[in-house]
Interface confidence: low
C-alpha cells in the first residue's frame, strides 16, 4: 500500500487491476437508444466528475517527484465512481442482466482504491451529486453517461500505472 511521505504503491498490482478495470468498463458500456451524440465535446464533461488534469502530477515528471498528488486524484475518482455504481442509478430498475460486468467493475474499483489508500491516513473523497432519477429511462441514460466518463478516467489511470510499473517500481 501507499503510505504518506512518498513511498510507492504496488505499481505492478495497480497496473494489472487498472487494466482489468479498462476491460470491464468497456464491456459494461450499455447500448442506449435515446441519445443523439453527434459529437460529444468537452463541454459535456461534468465539473463534478473527477478528472485527471495537467496540474495533478500524473505526468512522468510529476510521478517521479511525488506520486502522491496523482495517486490521491486517482483515488478520489475511484471512490466517486464506486459510489455511483453502488447507487440507485445502477441498482434500480431496469435491472442489470445477471451476467452484467457492472458488479465486477464495482468490486474492482473498490479493490484498486484500497491499494491506493494510505494506511492510517484519510484522503478526502469527492462528494457525489445527489442523483435520484425517478424513471427507468433516466437511469439508463445516466448509466450510459457514467460509464462513458468512467472509461475515460480508467484509461488515464491505467496509463499512469503502466508508467509507474515500468519506471518507478523498486
Amino acid at each position: 500500500r501507499a503510505v504518506p511521505g512518498g513511498s510507492s504503491p504496488a505499481w505492478t498490482q495497480c497496473q494489472q487491476l487498472s487494466q482489468k478495470l479498462c476491460t470491464l468498463a468497456w464491456s459494461a458500456h450499455p447500448l442506449v437508444g435515446h441519445m443523439d451524440l453527434r459529437e460529444e465535446g468537452d463541454e459535456e464533461t461534468t465539473n463534478d466528475v473527477p478528472h485527471i488534469q495537467c496540474g495533478d502530477g500524473c505526468d512522468p515528471q510529476g510521478l517521479r517527484d511525488n506520486s502522491q498528488f496523482c495517486l490521491q486524484r486517482i483515488h478520489q475518482g475511484l471512490i466517486f465512481y464506486e459510489k455511483l455504481l453502488g447507487s440507485d442509478i445502477f441498482t434500480g430498475e431496469p435491472s442489470l442482466l445477471p451476467d452484467s460486468p457492472v458488479g465486477q467493475l464495482h468490486a474492482s474499483l473498490l479493490g484498486l482504491s484500497q491499494l491506493l489508500q494510505p494506511e492510517g491516513h484519510h484522503w478526502e473523497t469527492q462528494q457525489i451529486p445527489s442523483l435520484s432519477p425517478s424513471q427507468p429511462w433516466q437511469r439508463l441514460l445516466l448509466r450510459f453517461k457514467i460509464l462513458r466518463s468512467l472509461q475515460a478516467f480508467v484509461a488515464v489511470a491505467a496509463r499512469v500505472f503502466a508508467h509507474g510499473a515500468a519506471t518507478l517500481s523498486p
Epitope: 459529437e39 465535446g41 442523483l131 441514460l141
Partner: nanobody, 128 residues
Framework: EVQLVESGGGLVQAGGSLRLSCAAS????????MGWFRQAPGKEREFVAR????????YYADSVKGRFTISRDNAKNTVYLQMNSLKPEDTAVYYC?????????????????????WGQGTQVTVSS
C-alpha cells in the same frame, strides 16, 4: 437575469408539425446548455430535450426521439424545438429552460429543479 420567452405553440392535428422558439433577453445563451420540458394537465413536468452550448451534444426523451429536433442559433440567442409527427399525448405546455452550468453534471439536465431560468410556457394541443 435572463428572460426566456417561448412561442410557436398552437392547435395542430395528429401527424402535424410545430416549431417552438425560445428567445432570450438579458444575457447571451451561448455559454449555457438549454432544455425543453413539458407539462401535461395533472402530470409532472418532464424532460423533452437538451442541447449543449455549441450544439455538439443533444439528448432526447425516449418518447420524442426521432420526431423532435432541438437546435439553437447562438447569434439570434434563440433555441428551437421542431416537433414532427405530433401525437395527442404530446399535448402539454412546453417550457424552455436554461441550465446554469455549461457542463454536463450527473443527472442534472434531466431534472427540472436543476434549471435556473424558465419561460412562461407555450401551449401545444394535438387533436386526433
Amino acid at each position: 437575469e435572463v428572460q426566456l420567452v417561448e412561442s410557436g405553440g398552437g392547435l395542430v392535428q395528429a401527424g402535424g408539425s410545430l416549431r417552438l422558439s425560445c428567445a432570450a433577453s438579458g444575457r447571451t445563451l451561448s455559454s449555457y446548455s438549454m432544455g425543453w420540458f413539458r407539462q401535461a394537465p395533472g402530470k409532472e413536468r418532464e424532460f423533452v430535450a437538451r442541447i449543449s452550448p455549441s450544439g455538439s451534444a443533444i439528448y432526447y426523451a425516449d418518447s420524442v426521439k426521432g420526431r423532435f429536433t432541438i437546435s439553437r442559433d447562438n447569434a439570434k440567442n434563440t433555441v428551437y424545438l421542431q416537433m414532427n409527427s405530433l401525437k395527442p399525448e404530446d399535448t402539454a405546455v412546453y417550457y424552455c429552460a436554461k441550465d446554469p452550468s455549461p457542463y454536463y453534471r450527473g443527472s442534472a439536465y434531466l431534472l427540472s429543479g436543476s434549471y435556473d431560468s424558465w419561460g412562461q410556457g407555450t401551449q401545444v394541443t394535438v387533436s386526433s
